[in-house]
Protein backbone atom coordinates (compact mmCIF):
# COMPACT_ATOMS: atom_id res chain seq x y z
CA UNK A 1 0.00 0.00 0.00
CA UNK A 2 1.17 3.68 -0.68
CA UNK A 3 1.80 6.29 1.27
CA UNK A 4 -1.08 8.76 1.49
CA UNK A 5 -1.91 12.60 2.76
CA UNK A 6 0.82 14.68 3.54
CA UNK A 7 3.34 12.69 2.70
CA UNK A 8 2.18 11.72 -0.60
CA UNK A 9 2.86 15.55 -1.49
CA UNK A 10 6.42 15.05 0.31
CA UNK A 11 6.73 12.25 -2.41
CA UNK A 12 5.86 14.29 -5.46
CA UNK A 13 8.04 17.15 -4.14
CA UNK A 14 10.81 14.65 -3.61
CA UNK A 15 10.36 13.37 -6.74
CA UNK A 16 10.12 16.97 -8.77
CA UNK A 17 13.01 18.46 -7.34
CA UNK A 18 15.50 15.46 -7.60
CA UNK A 19 14.44 15.39 -11.49
CA UNK A 20 15.30 18.62 -11.97
CA UNK A 21 18.44 17.83 -10.19
CA UNK A 22 18.89 15.15 -12.53
CA UNK A 23 18.99 17.46 -15.44
CA UNK A 24 20.83 20.19 -14.24
CA UNK A 25 23.50 17.22 -13.27
CA UNK A 26 22.85 15.63 -16.98
CA UNK A 27 23.07 19.23 -18.85
CA UNK A 28 26.60 20.39 -16.58
CA UNK A 29 28.00 16.52 -17.54
CA UNK A 30 27.00 17.06 -21.20
CA UNK A 31 28.75 20.52 -20.99
CA UNK A 32 32.10 19.27 -19.20
CA UNK A 33 32.41 16.28 -21.43
CA UNK A 34 32.09 19.45 -24.71
CA UNK A 35 34.72 21.29 -23.21
CA UNK A 36 36.74 18.80 -21.84
CA UNK A 37 37.05 16.78 -25.31
CA UNK A 38 35.75 19.83 -27.95
CA UNK A 39 39.59 20.24 -30.03
CA UNK A 40 38.47 24.67 -29.56
CA UNK A 41 38.68 24.33 -25.89
CA UNK A 42 41.21 21.78 -25.50
CA UNK A 43 43.61 24.40 -27.09
CA UNK A 44 42.61 26.82 -24.62
CA UNK A 45 42.96 24.57 -21.90
CA UNK A 46 46.43 23.91 -22.96
CA UNK A 47 46.60 27.25 -24.25
CA UNK A 48 49.32 27.19 -26.76
CA UNK A 49 51.20 29.03 -29.34
CA UNK A 50 53.58 26.43 -28.01
CA UNK A 51 53.08 24.12 -25.01
CA UNK A 52 52.93 25.84 -22.49
CA UNK A 53 49.93 25.12 -20.21
CA UNK A 54 47.27 26.92 -18.17
CA UNK A 55 47.00 26.95 -14.62
CA UNK A 56 46.36 23.25 -13.48
CA UNK A 57 43.49 24.75 -11.74
CA UNK A 58 41.65 25.04 -14.88
CA UNK A 59 42.87 22.05 -16.42
CA UNK A 60 41.63 19.96 -12.93
CA UNK A 61 38.38 21.94 -12.94
CA UNK A 62 36.92 20.36 -16.42
CA UNK A 63 37.24 17.00 -14.54
CA UNK A 64 35.38 18.62 -11.14
CA UNK A 65 32.75 19.91 -13.32
CA UNK A 66 32.46 16.45 -14.99
CA UNK A 67 32.54 14.32 -11.22
CA UNK A 68 29.45 17.21 -10.04
CA UNK A 69 27.52 16.29 -13.56
CA UNK A 70 27.65 13.06 -12.77
CA UNK A 71 27.20 13.28 -9.31
CA UNK A 72 24.16 15.18 -9.61
CA UNK A 73 22.61 13.15 -11.96
CA UNK A 74 23.72 9.96 -9.24
CA UNK A 75 22.16 11.61 -6.27
CA UNK A 76 19.13 13.23 -8.79
CA UNK A 77 18.33 9.35 -9.60
CA UNK A 78 18.24 8.08 -6.13
CA UNK A 79 16.16 10.77 -5.03
CA UNK A 80 13.68 10.33 -8.19
CA UNK A 81 13.75 6.33 -8.27
CA UNK A 82 13.66 6.25 -4.52
CA UNK A 83 11.03 8.71 -4.00
CA UNK A 84 8.64 7.26 -6.75
CA UNK A 85 9.07 3.86 -6.02
CA UNK A 86 8.98 4.40 -2.47
CA UNK A 87 11.92 2.16 -1.35
CA UNK A 88 13.53 2.91 1.77
CA UNK A 89 17.28 1.53 0.58
CA UNK A 90 17.53 4.14 -2.40
CA UNK A 91 16.03 7.05 -0.42
CA UNK A 92 18.47 5.66 2.70
CA UNK A 93 21.18 5.89 -0.02
CA UNK A 94 20.19 9.44 -0.76
CA UNK A 95 19.79 10.33 2.10
CA UNK A 96 23.55 9.12 3.32
CA UNK A 97 24.57 10.62 -0.20
CA UNK A 98 23.36 14.63 1.09
CA UNK A 99 25.36 13.98 4.28
CA UNK A 100 28.63 13.28 2.14
CA UNK A 101 27.80 16.10 -0.37
CA UNK A 102 27.22 18.17 2.16
CA UNK A 103 30.30 17.66 4.03
CA UNK A 104 31.94 17.97 0.94
CA UNK A 105 30.66 21.67 0.47
CA UNK A 106 31.21 22.97 3.82
CA UNK A 107 35.11 21.37 3.33
CA UNK A 108 35.09 22.86 0.03
CA UNK A 109 33.66 26.25 1.43
CA UNK A 110 36.90 26.33 4.00
CA UNK A 111 39.42 25.50 1.73
CA UNK A 112 38.04 27.87 -1.07
CA UNK A 113 37.88 30.58 1.95
CA UNK A 114 41.21 29.84 2.93
CA UNK A 115 42.95 29.68 -0.23
CA UNK A 116 40.35 32.49 -2.02
CA UNK A 117 43.98 34.80 -3.00
CA UNK A 118 45.25 31.91 -5.03
CA UNK A 119 42.27 30.93 -6.81
CA UNK A 120 41.97 34.85 -7.51
CA UNK A 121 45.28 34.86 -8.66
CA UNK A 122 44.32 31.44 -10.63
CA UNK A 123 41.60 33.14 -12.34
CA UNK A 124 43.57 36.30 -13.41
CA UNK A 125 45.64 34.48 -15.03
CA UNK A 126 43.68 32.00 -16.48
CA UNK A 127 42.03 35.61 -17.52
CA UNK A 128 44.81 37.04 -18.86
CA UNK A 129 45.75 33.55 -21.56
CA UNK A 130 42.49 33.99 -22.64
CA UNK A 131 42.81 37.26 -23.28
CA UNK A 132 46.21 36.66 -25.03
CA UNK A 133 44.82 33.60 -27.19
CA UNK A 134 42.24 35.90 -28.33
CA UNK A 135 43.80 38.62 -29.86
CA UNK A 136 47.05 36.18 -30.78
CA UNK A 137 45.27 33.36 -32.24
CA UNK A 138 42.73 34.92 -35.04
CA UNK A 139 40.94 31.27 -34.81
CA UNK A 140 40.85 30.52 -30.91
CA UNK A 141 36.52 31.12 -30.86
CA UNK A 142 36.75 29.32 -27.56
CA UNK A 143 38.88 31.98 -26.23
CA UNK A 144 37.06 34.44 -27.52
CA UNK A 145 34.11 33.26 -25.79
CA UNK A 146 35.68 32.85 -22.49
CA UNK A 147 37.11 36.40 -22.66
CA UNK A 148 33.52 38.01 -23.59
CA UNK A 149 32.26 35.94 -20.62
CA UNK A 150 34.44 37.60 -18.09
CA UNK A 151 33.75 40.82 -19.39
CA UNK A 152 30.28 40.79 -19.70
CA UNK A 153 30.09 39.05 -16.40
CA UNK A 154 32.28 41.64 -14.52
CA UNK A 155 31.28 44.32 -16.57
CA UNK A 156 35.29 45.12 -17.21
CA UNK A 157 37.14 44.93 -20.18
CA UNK A 158 40.75 43.99 -20.15
CA UNK A 159 43.71 43.91 -18.25
CA UNK A 160 46.36 46.58 -16.92
CA UNK A 161 48.71 44.53 -16.81
CA UNK A 162 48.23 43.82 -20.61
CA UNK A 163 47.56 47.05 -21.81
CA UNK A 164 48.68 46.66 -26.02
CA UNK A 165 46.38 43.38 -26.12
CA UNK A 166 43.50 45.26 -24.02
CA UNK A 167 43.43 47.87 -26.82
CA UNK A 168 43.06 45.17 -29.56
CA UNK A 169 40.25 43.37 -27.66
CA UNK A 170 38.19 46.24 -27.16
CA UNK A 171 37.91 46.78 -31.06
CA UNK A 172 37.11 42.98 -31.40
CA UNK A 173 33.81 43.47 -29.83
CA UNK A 174 35.17 41.78 -26.53
CA UNK A 175 34.55 44.43 -24.55
CA UNK A 176 30.61 45.83 -23.27
CA UNK A 177 29.79 48.14 -25.02
CA UNK A 178 30.48 50.96 -23.38
CA UNK A 179 34.04 50.93 -23.30
CA UNK A 180 34.86 51.33 -26.74
CA UNK A 181 37.48 54.50 -26.51
CA UNK A 182 41.00 53.74 -25.53
CA UNK A 183 41.20 56.63 -22.82
CA UNK A 184 37.99 54.97 -20.86
CA UNK A 185 39.76 51.88 -21.29
CA UNK A 186 41.92 51.16 -17.51
CA UNK A 187 38.69 51.85 -15.48
CA UNK A 188 37.57 48.53 -15.98
CA UNK A 189 40.31 46.21 -15.53
CA UNK A 190 39.45 43.03 -15.18
CA UNK A 191 41.95 42.10 -12.76
CA UNK A 192 40.77 44.87 -10.43
CA UNK A 193 37.14 43.41 -10.56
CA UNK A 194 38.44 39.77 -9.86
CA UNK A 195 40.03 41.17 -6.85
CA UNK A 196 36.52 42.73 -6.01
CA UNK A 197 34.57 39.29 -6.73
CA UNK A 198 37.48 37.85 -4.17
CA UNK A 199 37.34 40.14 -1.43
CA UNK A 200 34.29 42.45 -1.50
CA UNK A 201 31.95 40.35 -3.22
CA UNK A 202 33.02 37.42 -1.24
CA UNK A 203 29.33 37.32 0.53
CA UNK A 204 27.87 36.49 -2.47
CA UNK A 205 29.56 33.46 -3.18
CA UNK A 206 28.72 32.65 0.95
CA UNK A 207 25.01 33.29 0.16
CA UNK A 208 24.90 30.67 -2.95
CA UNK A 209 26.81 28.11 -1.08
CA UNK A 210 24.08 28.23 1.85
CA UNK A 211 21.35 28.58 -0.72
CA UNK A 212 22.46 25.23 -1.68
CA UNK A 213 23.49 23.97 1.89
CA UNK A 214 19.66 24.80 3.10
CA UNK A 215 18.30 22.86 -0.18
CA UNK A 216 20.38 20.04 0.94
CA UNK A 217 18.85 19.88 4.61
CA UNK A 218 15.35 20.84 3.31
CA UNK A 219 15.68 17.14 0.70
CA UNK A 220 17.61 15.66 4.14
CA UNK A 221 14.74 16.08 6.13
CA UNK A 222 12.17 15.02 2.94
CA UNK A 223 13.88 11.77 2.44
CA UNK A 224 13.46 11.23 6.02
CA UNK A 225 10.23 12.15 6.50
CA UNK A 226 9.29 9.83 3.13
CA UNK A 227 11.18 6.98 4.68
CA UNK A 228 9.33 7.43 8.11
CA UNK A 229 5.76 7.43 6.22
CA UNK A 230 7.09 4.55 3.85
CA UNK A 231 7.86 2.69 7.19
CA UNK A 232 4.69 3.09 8.83
CA UNK A 233 2.10 2.69 5.85
CA UNK A 234 4.17 -0.23 5.29
CA UNK A 235 3.18 -1.64 8.94
CA UNK A 236 -0.39 -1.24 8.60
CA UNK B 1 46.67 40.13 -51.53
CA UNK B 2 47.48 43.12 -49.31
CA UNK B 3 49.31 46.49 -50.30
CA UNK B 4 50.14 49.38 -48.75
CA UNK B 5 51.20 52.34 -51.05
CA UNK B 6 52.47 55.45 -49.56
CA UNK B 7 52.74 59.34 -51.10
CA UNK B 8 55.82 59.86 -52.51
CA UNK B 9 59.09 61.97 -51.15
CA UNK B 10 58.30 65.59 -49.98
CA UNK B 11 60.76 68.68 -49.17
CA UNK B 12 60.00 70.85 -46.96
CA UNK B 13 60.96 73.68 -44.89
CA UNK B 14 61.68 73.86 -41.48
CA UNK B 15 58.64 74.81 -39.09
CA UNK B 16 56.19 73.46 -41.63
CA UNK B 17 53.62 70.87 -41.46
CA UNK B 18 53.45 67.80 -44.08
CA UNK B 19 50.81 65.06 -44.40
CA UNK B 20 52.05 61.47 -45.40
CA UNK B 21 49.28 59.11 -46.80
CA UNK B 22 48.69 55.11 -46.85
CA UNK B 23 46.68 53.58 -49.15
CA UNK B 24 45.71 50.12 -48.20
CA UNK B 25 44.06 47.51 -50.39
CA UNK B 26 43.47 43.47 -50.17
CA UNK B 27 41.87 43.17 -46.73
CA UNK B 28 38.85 45.12 -44.24
CA UNK B 29 40.70 48.37 -43.94
CA UNK B 30 37.78 49.51 -41.53
CA UNK B 31 38.63 46.66 -38.72
CA UNK B 32 42.20 46.62 -38.66
CA UNK B 33 44.98 48.70 -37.07
CA UNK B 34 47.28 50.80 -39.04
CA UNK B 35 50.52 51.78 -37.07
CA UNK B 36 53.60 54.03 -38.11
CA UNK B 37 57.40 54.01 -38.28
CA UNK B 38 59.91 56.45 -38.76
CA UNK B 39 63.63 55.09 -39.71
CA UNK B 40 66.21 58.41 -40.13
CA UNK B 41 69.21 57.86 -42.56
CA UNK B 42 71.52 54.70 -41.50
CA UNK B 43 69.65 54.51 -38.11
CA UNK B 44 67.50 52.31 -36.76
CA UNK B 45 63.09 52.13 -36.42
CA UNK B 46 61.28 53.91 -34.00
CA UNK B 47 57.60 53.30 -33.37
CA UNK B 48 55.42 56.54 -33.73
CA UNK B 49 51.92 54.99 -33.17
CA UNK B 50 48.76 53.20 -33.94
CA UNK B 51 45.14 53.85 -35.42
CA UNK B 52 42.36 51.67 -35.83
CA UNK B 53 41.21 52.51 -38.99
CA UNK B 54 37.25 51.66 -37.84
CA UNK B 55 36.42 54.63 -35.66
CA UNK B 56 40.26 56.66 -35.72
CA UNK B 57 40.58 55.70 -31.96
CA UNK B 58 44.85 56.18 -31.78
CA UNK B 59 47.69 55.06 -29.13
CA UNK B 60 51.12 57.52 -29.67
CA UNK B 61 54.54 56.92 -28.22
CA UNK B 62 54.98 59.89 -25.95
CA UNK B 63 58.07 60.99 -27.68
CA UNK B 64 55.87 61.64 -30.80
CA UNK B 65 52.76 63.47 -28.84
CA UNK B 66 52.11 66.84 -30.43
CA UNK B 67 54.58 66.01 -33.46
CA UNK B 68 52.53 63.37 -35.19
CA UNK B 69 48.31 63.30 -36.21
CA UNK B 70 47.47 59.80 -36.95
CA UNK B 71 43.85 60.20 -38.70
CA UNK B 72 42.14 57.16 -41.26
CA UNK B 73 39.63 57.84 -44.05
CA UNK B 74 37.86 54.90 -44.25
CA UNK B 75 35.86 55.68 -47.51
CA UNK B 76 38.96 55.62 -49.16
CA UNK B 77 40.99 53.12 -47.09
CA UNK B 78 43.82 55.67 -46.81
CA UNK B 79 45.39 56.46 -43.89
CA UNK B 80 47.10 59.79 -42.67
CA UNK B 81 49.90 60.95 -40.60
CA UNK B 82 50.27 64.47 -40.23
CA UNK B 83 53.98 65.80 -38.81
CA UNK B 84 54.03 69.68 -37.78
CA UNK B 85 56.78 72.32 -36.72
CA UNK B 86 58.92 70.66 -39.10
CA UNK B 87 62.67 70.45 -37.84
CA UNK B 88 65.94 68.63 -39.39
CA UNK B 89 65.35 65.83 -36.80
CA UNK B 90 62.28 65.04 -39.15
CA UNK B 91 64.22 64.21 -42.25
CA UNK B 92 63.64 60.45 -42.11
CA UNK B 93 61.94 57.88 -44.01
CA UNK B 94 58.08 56.60 -42.54
CA UNK B 95 56.82 53.85 -43.27
CA UNK B 96 53.00 52.26 -42.13
CA UNK B 97 52.33 49.24 -41.32
CA UNK B 98 49.56 46.89 -41.06
CA UNK B 99 48.44 45.11 -37.93
CA UNK B 100 46.79 41.28 -38.73
CA UNK B 101 42.94 41.58 -38.42
CA UNK B 102 42.63 40.51 -34.40
CA UNK B 103 44.86 43.30 -33.72
CA UNK B 104 47.89 41.08 -33.22
CA UNK B 105 50.52 44.01 -32.63
CA UNK B 106 52.21 42.31 -35.41
CA UNK B 107 53.79 44.87 -37.96
CA UNK B 108 52.73 42.03 -40.62
CA UNK B 109 52.64 43.85 -44.10
CA UNK B 110 54.37 47.47 -44.74
CA UNK B 111 54.40 50.64 -47.28
CA UNK B 112 57.95 51.10 -49.36
CA UNK B 113 57.79 53.98 -46.98
CA UNK B 114 57.85 57.98 -47.92
CA UNK B 115 60.59 60.14 -47.65
CA UNK B 116 60.77 63.59 -45.48
CA UNK B 117 63.28 66.15 -46.43
CA UNK B 118 63.82 69.06 -44.26
CA UNK B 119 65.48 71.50 -45.47
CA UNK B 120 66.05 75.27 -45.49
CA UNK C 1 60.07 52.63 -22.04
CA UNK C 2 61.72 49.05 -22.84
CA UNK C 3 64.94 49.22 -24.32
CA UNK C 4 66.14 46.65 -26.67
CA UNK C 5 70.06 46.39 -27.49
CA UNK C 6 71.35 44.24 -30.05
CA UNK C 7 74.91 42.51 -30.16
CA UNK C 8 76.83 42.67 -32.33
CA UNK C 9 76.06 45.37 -34.12
CA UNK C 10 77.51 43.99 -37.58
CA UNK C 11 78.76 40.05 -38.29
CA UNK C 12 80.49 38.49 -40.81
CA UNK C 13 79.92 35.26 -41.48
CA UNK C 14 81.09 32.51 -44.35
CA UNK C 15 78.01 31.27 -46.79
CA UNK C 16 76.64 28.25 -45.30
CA UNK C 17 77.16 28.32 -41.98
CA UNK C 18 75.54 29.51 -38.53
CA UNK C 19 74.42 33.36 -37.94
CA UNK C 20 73.38 33.96 -34.35
CA UNK C 21 72.31 37.59 -33.06
CA UNK C 22 70.81 38.27 -29.45
CA UNK C 23 68.29 40.85 -28.28
CA UNK C 24 68.60 41.68 -24.51
CA UNK C 25 65.37 43.55 -23.19
CA UNK C 26 65.73 46.38 -20.60
CA UNK C 27 62.72 44.32 -18.88
CA UNK C 28 61.00 40.99 -19.29
CA UNK C 29 58.66 40.69 -22.24
CA UNK C 30 57.14 37.43 -21.71
CA UNK C 31 54.31 36.24 -19.67
CA UNK C 32 53.03 32.75 -18.83
CA UNK C 33 52.26 31.93 -22.30
CA UNK C 34 53.80 34.16 -25.07
CA UNK C 35 57.00 36.31 -25.49
CA UNK C 36 56.25 39.48 -27.46
CA UNK C 37 59.56 39.79 -29.18
CA UNK C 38 59.76 39.32 -32.84
CA UNK C 39 62.10 39.33 -35.73
CA UNK C 40 62.34 42.01 -38.93
CA UNK C 41 65.17 41.62 -41.96
CA UNK C 42 65.45 45.01 -43.89
CA UNK C 43 67.73 45.07 -46.84
CA UNK C 44 68.85 48.34 -48.50
CA UNK C 45 65.98 50.22 -50.04
CA UNK C 46 63.21 48.01 -48.61
CA UNK C 47 60.86 48.24 -45.58
CA UNK C 48 61.44 45.72 -42.87
CA UNK C 49 59.97 42.21 -43.59
CA UNK C 50 58.54 39.81 -40.65
CA UNK C 51 60.31 36.70 -39.84
CA UNK C 52 59.95 35.93 -36.80
CA UNK C 53 56.89 36.69 -34.06
CA UNK C 54 56.02 35.29 -30.31
CA UNK C 55 60.30 34.60 -30.21
CA UNK C 56 60.10 31.58 -32.20
CA UNK C 57 57.41 30.89 -34.38
CA UNK C 58 58.36 31.59 -38.46
CA UNK C 59 56.29 33.79 -40.39
CA UNK C 60 54.43 31.78 -43.05
CA UNK C 61 56.53 32.04 -46.10
CA UNK C 62 59.97 32.60 -44.16
CA UNK C 63 62.15 29.68 -45.04
CA UNK C 64 63.19 27.10 -42.24
CA UNK C 65 66.73 28.36 -42.11
CA UNK C 66 65.56 31.08 -39.69
CA UNK C 67 64.43 30.35 -36.29
CA UNK C 68 64.21 32.10 -33.19
CA UNK C 69 64.44 31.05 -29.13
CA UNK C 70 64.43 32.74 -26.04
CA UNK C 71 62.13 34.54 -23.16
CA UNK C 72 61.91 36.98 -20.72
CA UNK C 73 64.84 39.58 -21.02
CA UNK C 74 66.77 37.30 -24.00
CA UNK C 75 66.20 36.37 -27.51
CA UNK C 76 68.42 35.25 -30.12
CA UNK C 77 67.81 34.32 -34.10
CA UNK C 78 69.52 32.04 -36.21
CA UNK C 79 70.21 31.30 -39.43
CA UNK C 80 71.84 28.11 -40.47
CA UNK C 81 72.38 27.54 -43.33
CA UNK C 82 72.98 31.29 -44.25
CA UNK C 83 72.50 32.08 -47.94
CA UNK C 84 73.57 35.04 -50.26
CA UNK C 85 70.10 36.48 -49.67
CA UNK C 86 70.21 36.74 -46.13
CA UNK C 87 72.37 39.88 -46.28
CA UNK C 88 70.43 42.97 -44.64
CA UNK C 89 70.01 44.47 -41.28
CA UNK C 90 68.16 42.39 -38.85
CA UNK C 91 65.99 44.07 -35.67
CA UNK C 92 64.36 43.17 -32.76
CA UNK C 93 60.99 44.48 -32.03
CA UNK C 94 58.69 44.21 -28.91
CA UNK C 95 54.64 44.65 -28.35
CA UNK C 96 54.27 43.70 -24.73
CA UNK C 97 53.46 47.80 -24.02
CA UNK C 98 53.26 50.89 -25.22
CA UNK C 99 55.60 52.21 -26.72
CA UNK C 100 56.35 49.49 -29.02
CA UNK C 101 60.24 49.66 -29.77
CA UNK C 102 63.27 47.93 -31.74
CA UNK C 103 66.32 47.18 -31.25
CA UNK C 104 69.81 48.63 -32.48
CA UNK C 105 70.02 46.49 -35.18
CA UNK C 106 72.25 43.85 -36.62
CA UNK C 107 73.92 43.89 -40.22
CA UNK C 108 74.57 40.38 -41.41
CA UNK C 109 77.35 39.95 -44.10
CA UNK C 110 77.97 37.27 -46.13
CA UNK C 111 81.92 36.11 -46.66
Known amino acids: MGVEGCTKCIKYLLFVFNFVFWLAGGVILGVALWLRHDPQTTNLLYLELGDKPAPNTFYVGIYILIAVGAVMMFVGFLGCYGAIQESQCLLGTFFTCLVILFACEVAAGIWGFVNKDQIAKDVKQFYDQALQQAVVDDDANNAKAVVKTFHETLDCCGSSTLTALTTSVLKNNLCPSGSNIISNLFKEDCHQKIDDLFSGKLYLIGIAAIVVAVIMIFEMILSMVLCCGIRNSSVY | QVQLQQSGPELVKPGASVKISCKAS????????MNWVKQRPGKGLEWIGR????????IYNGKFKGKATLTADKSSSTAYMQLSSLTSEDSAVYFC?????????????WGQGSALTVSS | DIVLTQSPASLSVSLGQRATISCRAS??????????MHWYQQKPGQPPKLLIK???YLESGVPARFSGSGSGTDFTLNIHPVEEEDAATYYC?????????FGTGTKLEIK
Open chain 2, 97 to 109: AREGKTGDLLLRS
Open chain 2, 26 to 33: GYTFSSSW
Open chain 2, 51 to 58: IYSGDGDA
Open chain 3, 27 to 36: KSVSTSIYSY
Open chain 3, 54 to 56: YAS
Open chain 3, 93 to 101: EHSREFPFT
